[in-house]
């Protein structure tokens, strides 16, 4: 049962991480000046990806920001204290 729970948790976070890497891909496109304006669609991620943050992720949505923080917390739990310290130092910048 524990393995199933871990599987569900990992799957959920894999989806979130997929979203974030898609966001990073968009970010690199923006940095290279590729394509037109972002956002405007009616899909699941139709938020404008316009504001830059210390961790290099674009977001204008508070719920997306919370998802990013959840990913950080999850990675800290999985990867341990050293990762958490790195995350903390980055957040303080």
């Amino acid at each position: 049962r524990r393995d199933v729970a871990h599987g569900i948790l990992n799957e959920a976070y894999r989806k979130v991480l997929d979203q974030l890497s898609a966001g990073k891909h968009l970010q690199s496109l923006v940095a290279r000046g590729v394509g037109g304006s972002l956002g405007g669609g009616a899909g699941d991620d139709a938020e404008p990806l316009s504001k830059r943050h210390s961790d290099g992720i674009f977001t204008d949505s508070y719920s997306r920001y919370r998802k990013q923080m959840a990913v950080k917390k999850y990675l800290a739990a999985v990867l341990g204290k050293r990762y958490k310290q790195r995350v903390k130092n980055k957040g303080r910048r």
Partner: antibody, heavy 117, light 112 residues
Framework: EVQLVQSGAEVKKPGESVKVSCKAS????????MHWVRQAPGQGLEWMGL????????RYAQKFQGRVTITADESTSTAYMELSSLRSEDTAVYYC??????????WGQGTLVTVSS | DIVMTQSPDSLAVSLGERATINCKSS???????????LNWLQQKPGQPPKRLIY???TRESGVPDRFSGSGSGTDFTLTISSLQAEDVAVYYC?????????FGGGTKVEIK
Amino acid sequence: EVQLVQSGAEVKKPGESVKVSCKASGFTFTDSYMHWVRQAPGQGLEWMGLIYPFSADTRYAQKFQGRVTITADESTSTAYMELSSLRSEDTAVYYCAIDYDGSFAYWGQGTLVTVSS
Amino acid sequence: DIVMTQSPDSLAVSLGERATINCKSSQSLLDADGKTYLNWLQQKPGQPPKRLIYWASTRESGVPDRFSGSGSGTDFTLTISSLQAEDVAVYYCWQGTWFDLTFGGGTKVEIK
């Protein structure tokens, strides 16, 4: 019982800085988002920024960018809001508020900061 | 920033009568996660604000059922179905969907 207890009233001169504290209890501090909101006398509410204590990530309102610093001390479950280069328009009650679900479920009692020469 | 426009600025209602406060946002508050982060606060003189309604229509536990929230997208309403003396306060809507988080200007509710 969830509680947010803020530091006492402050009187400051223009150009100075103020640091307000907010001590949290009754919940897991690192699992929350701590926000700061201010209210000038007889005016409405204004969001200043937030901190996620677990990672120390912050997000500030554009209006206060460069002038506000929000920090958190996990060991004491205390959040701090420092506002610099104070001017008379910064006279207000400053509130901390906790968010679990995309909304401010609990608020501190408020800290009056008076800026006067 | 999202502009939150509340109306009216003040409202005088007889005890037992209905009070209706409107809140309009300059952009849809429906988030990608399917929730609408529109909230209603009540603030009495000398006190911090208190959460009444979150997610547009979910009542905070312990809040009397005479308070209800409705609406979607950009148009929202707080209704007090039967005004009581203890409901005299300023009511604020605010949005938690988009940064920067923003508040309406408030509606002062008084007894006629």
